[in-house]
């Protein structure tokens, strides 16, 4: 004899008007806008012996649905009308003919928040089971893409950046990728849930923001996750850093995909200007400044890169008169102070005048 | 919790009719098969018929083919018996009785088991000239 | 039409006896078979379906066995309660049917 599932009388909440008619859902479920939730559902009815081999059907229903006039949210009858605005987001999973009446709500929305109950048609069987129902919340969407930076961001060196959304479903419409950054960048392979920005940072992008943008289409909703870029020159071992953005600058809403497109004579100017300045600096502090550059973790760190709640931007004061740059060899005491204080742009701003050309490009 | 209540017993002679009625109260009526079984004095159980409430279809034991029109009345929640061309061997208490299919295995292959769960309190029909 | 064939028609026991009666279908009805009882003057009570399980609100003193043919009721200890009529009914095929009953009475 097969086994008997008589238990189910007992589960609390499972009993509908007809104690032989009963259903076990879970009475609440919370799901954040854009996202998806799978709702288990089981449920039980009679067969009277003239229905015994009609096909099952099975319907949710919007709370106070008539259901001679108003159109299911979801159903397993091919030919049923359903409700416009679920359409292709609500979907009845489970198979009734196994008892199984389980929900699937996709790309959630603001509006269907509600309570929902399902029906059993069988035949001439046919059954609403009014309690318990399922109450659907749908709440703002908390999650966060994250960016994952493989290593260290070196001037003129490639790095593939990961934006990803591991929280996202499936089942769902697939997001909409959008980046933005003044650095100078192309776009990667993408897969359901993550898109990859080719970056080549320069030094003047240092400090600069970097912006993924997530669009969940099918709810109308955005999400996105900035970093500042810590470019720095470091010939140690890299490491990889995720940067999740707590305290990593505020959040900016953008676009899409920016390339920063700078002229050659601006590059070119900016690089002399940098030689100049590190120059100076060697001149003037000598070792005492590299040495307390290596000690200071918090502001200059001379290995590794920074993470960006340590991050602060450090201005270089020079003197007001033009030092002299005439590109002449540098000494040996220079290499010597320039091993000190390592090649690193923690301080260095983009220019004021460098003009930064945006541009658009989008991943979907 | 569902019940069957059924009307009062009847007196017929041979040849008439007798139309039971079976009124189901506080459960769910149109989804069970309502049976009909009846009982001669003294003797054992016989089943006659069923009516499926929601379409009004039938099917009885060939014994009774001809004679027997079981209906409902969905308004109200009542089903009748009639049996026609009584004969003095018609006396018997007729009931009816709810038939459900009380369990179910999970699975591709579900398996349903039916009893009459659920009784009349039964009619008395005498038929005698 | 299946045939159902109990034994013995009537029983005489005590209380507190354990007690047996026996049901035999004509062909196989794999396990679809119940169980009533029925006392004078009452419309008849579902006792077991599926040949084995216990309708709800039945004292677990009524046990019932058996698969295809033949079929057993037991009452493990009688209660003053139990002394009634008792039908096996096959509910594998149409019409249903009744076994002609066992009559349990007081010794």
């Known amino acids: 004899m097969p086994l008997l599932l008589l238990l189910p009388l007992l589960w609390a909440g499972a009993l509908a008007m007809d104690p032989n008619f009963w259903l076990q859902v879970q009475e609440s479920v919370t799901v954040q806008e854009g996202l998806c939730v799978l709702v288990p559902c089981t449920f039980f009815h009679p067969i009277p012996y003239y229905d015994k081999n009609s096909p099952v059907h099975g319907y949710w229903f919007r709370e106070g649905a008539i259901i001679s006039r108003d159109s299911p949210v979801a159903t397993n009858k091919l030919d049923q009308e359903v409700q416009e605005e679920t359409q292709g987001r609500f979907r009845l999973l489970g198979d009734p003919s196994r008892n199984n009446c389980s929900l699937s709500i996709v790309d959630a929305r603001r509006r269907d928040n509600g309570s929902y109950f399902f029906r059993m048609e069988r035949g001439s069987t046919k059954y609403s089971y009014k309690s318990p129902q399922l109450s659907v919340h749908v709440t703002d969407l908390t999650h966060r893409p994250k960016i994952l930076i493989p290593g260290t961001l070196e001037p003129g060196h490639s790095k593939n950046l990961t934006c990803s959304v591991s929280w996202a479903c499936e089942q769902g419409t697939p997001p909409i990728f959008s980046w933005l950054s003044a650095a100078p960048t192309s776009l990667g392979p993408r897969t359901t849930h993550s898109s990859v920005l080719i970056i080549t940072p320069r030094p003047q992008d240092h400090g600069t923001n970097l912006t993924c943008q997530v669009k969940f289409a099918g709810a109308g909703v955005t999400t996105e996750r900035t970093i500042q870029l810590n470019v720095t020159y470091v010939p140690q071992n890299p490491t990889t850093g995720i940067f999740p953005g707590d305290g990593s600058g505020k959040q900016e809403t953008r676009a899409g995909v920016v390339h920063g497109a700078i002229g050659g004579a601006g590059v070119t100017a900016l690089l002399a200007l940098c030689l100049c300045l590190i120059f100076f600096i060697v001149k003037t502090h000598r070792r005492k400044a590299a040495r307390t550059a290596v000690g200071r973790n918090d502001t200059h760190p001379t290995t590794g890169s920074a993470s960006p709640k340590h991050q602060k931007k450090s201005k270089l004061h020079g003197p007001t008169e033009t030092s002299s740059c005439s590109g002449a060899a540098p000494t040996v005491e220079m290499d010597e102070e320039l091993h000190y204080a390592s090649l690193n742009f923690h301080g260095m701003n983009p220019s004021k005048d460098t003009s930064t050309e945006y541009s658009e490009v989008r991943t979907q | 919790q569902v019940q069957l209540v059924q009307s009062g017993a009847e007196v017929k002679k041979p040849g008439a009719s007798v139309k039971v009625s079976c009124k189901a109260s506080g459960g769910t009526f149109s989804n069970y098969a309502i049976n009909w079984v009846r009982q001669a004095p003294g003797q054992g159980l016989e089943w006659m018929g069923w009516i499926n409430p929601n379409s009004g279809g039938t099917d009885s034991a060939q014994k009774f083919q001809g004679r027997v029109t079981m209906t409902r009345d969905t308004s109200t929640s009542t089903v009748y018996m009639e049996l026609s061309s009584l004969r003095s061997e018609d006396t018997a208490v007729y009931y009816c009785?709810?038939?459900?299919?009380?369990?179910?295995?999970?699975?591709?292959?579900?398996?349903?088991?039916?009893?009459?769960?659920?009784w009349g309190q039964g009619t008395t029909v005498t038929v005698s000239s | 039409d299946i045939q159902m064939t109990q034994s013995p028609s009537s029983l005489s026991a005590s209380v507190g006896d354990r007690v047996t009666i026996t049901c035999q279908a004509s062909q196989d009805i794999s396990d679809h078979l119940n169980w009533y009882q029925q006392k004078p003057g009452k419309a008849p009570k579902l006792l077991i379906y599926?040949?084995?399980t216990l309708q709800s609100g039945v004292p677990s003193r009524f046990s019932g066995s058996g698969s295809g043919t033949d079929f057993t009721l037991t009452i493990s200890s009688l209660q003053p309660e139990d002394f009634a009529t008792y039908y096996c009914q096959q509910a594998y095929s149409f019409p249903w049917t009744f076994g002609q009953g066992t009559k349990l009475e007081i010794k």
């Open positions: 599926g040949a084995s």
């Open positions: 009785a709810r038939d459900s299919s009380l369990a179910l295995s999970y699975g591709g292959n579900s398996e349903y088991y039916y009893g009459m769960d659920v």
